[in-house]
């Protein structure tokens, strides 16, 4: 039995940031799971991992340098990516593994989401100094 995953076919990161929602045919509430996002046709780069342990706080990390966060819905995990680079334009695949309770479940490979990163359009001008932080 495999979990089905739905993703948007394409997203554009206009300001080097994007939110990618992974929708599952499975309710993750009160489950121990590992949701991850993978980059490339071969899914070779694990972009971000969101680890959920029942109703506790999500643990988020990246072994590959991506700035990411995650939000949990009953049947979804949304990955928030910041500081993306133009050369990270690629196809991204959602993956889900449910560790507990048994049986172990994972997903059928999804169609993926093409994330097109459009860099910040910087137009420096002496008349308009940079923004200020509070």
């Amino acid at each position: 039995n495999k979990i089905l995953v739905k993703q948007s076919p394409m997203l554009v990161a206009y300001d080097n940031a994007v939110n990618l929602s992974c929708k599952y045919s499975y309710n993750l509430f009160s489950r121990e799971f590992r949701a991850s996002l993978h980059k490339g046709l071969d899914s070779a780069v694990e972009v971000c991992v969101v680890y959920g342990n029942y109703s506790q706080q999500l643990q988020v990390y990246s072994k590959t340098g991506f700035n990411c966060d995650g939000k949990l819905g009953n049947e979804s995990v949304t990955f928030y990516l910041q500081n993306l680079y133009v050369n990270q334009t690629d196809i991204y695949f959602c993956k889900i593994e449910v560790m507990y309770p048994p049986p172990y479940l994972d997903n059928e490979k999804s169609n993926g989401t093409i994330i097109h990163v459009k860099g910040k359009h910087l137009c420096p001008s002496p008349l308009f100094p940079g923004p200020s932080k509070p």
Partner: antibody
Framework: EVQLVETGGGLVQPGESLRLSCAAS????????MHWVRQAPGKGLVWISR????????SSADSVRGRFTISRDNAKNTLYLQMNSLRAEDTAVYYC?????????????WGQGTLVTVSS | EIVLTQSPATLSLSPGERATLSCRAS??????LAWYQQKPGQAPRLLIY???NRATGIPARFSGSGSGTDFTLTISSLEPEDFAVYYC?????????FGQGTKVEIK
């Protein structure tokens, strides 16, 4: 005026636990990511943990993952760091810091720090 | 993780002189680089964010430049209160990392 005040530091033995607190005021605490950054005596700054604005997600550096847990109570405007299985190399001044939602890891405001000493 | 290397480790200058501090990243961090000032016994203070933007209340004598892997903090004319340790920090790649610091001391 933004204020962050850390408390809870002290002298503990290796293997023991400690909980640090950071009381926040002067801003909308529940709208900001919060962080812990530490500085060993005479050394540089090292980011160790963060929590998002509603406390639903967290990340930690490899050096503390599995031992330290960050949490927050938005009703009390307080950030916490639960430190378990402490080691001598955890000896440092621990700072809490604030970032905003558009720049997750840019540390706009800092507390004055609290010293944690791990020694037998 | 990205390693930030600051140079020099110590800079000995007199008030009124120009200070130039360098920060080099082990790989590109785009413009996601910040500078902090830390005085003895105090917390760090954000000076510059995103390479060249001054934080609120930071005097115009502080400026930042660079992109990719090479960055510079310049203090155009040192004031007595500027003698401190300066750290660069990147947020372009996770986890965020700091340089080891440059101490600006009175000559």
């Amino acid at each position: 005026e933004v204020q962050l005040v850390e408390t809870g530091g002290g002298l503990v033995q290796p293997g023991e636990s400690l909980r640090l607190s950071c009381a926040a005021s002067g801003f909308s605490f529940s709208s900001n990511w919060m962080h812990w950054v530490r500085q060993a005596p005479g050394k540089g700054l090292v980011w160790i943990s963060r929590i998002n604005s509603d406390g639903s997600s967290a990340s930690s550096a490899d050096s503390v993952r599995g031992r330290f847990t960050i949490s927050r109570d938005n009703a009390k405007n307080t950030l916490y760091l639960q430190m378990n299985s402490l080691r001598a190399e955890d000896t440092a001044v621990y700072y809490c810091a604030r970032s905003d939602s558009s720049s997750w890891y840019e540390f706009e405001y800092w507390g004055q720090g609290t010293l944690v000493t791990v020694s037998s | 993780e990205i390693v930030l290397t600051q140079s020099p480790a110590t800079l000995s200058l007199s008030p009124g002189e120009r200070a130039t501090l360098s920060c080099r990243a082990s790989q590109s961090v785009s413009n996601y680089l910040a500078w902090y000032q830390q005085k003895p016994g105090q917390a760090p203070r954000l000076l510059i964010y995103d390479t060249s933007n001054r934080a609120t209340g930071i005097p115009a004598r502080f400026s930042g430049s660079g992109s990719g892997t090479d960055f510079t903090l310049t203090i155009s004319s040192l004031e007595p209160e500027d003698f401190a340790v300066y750290y660069c920090q990147q947020r372009g790649n996770w986890p965020p990392t700091f340089g080891q610091g440059t101490k600006v001391e009175i000559k």
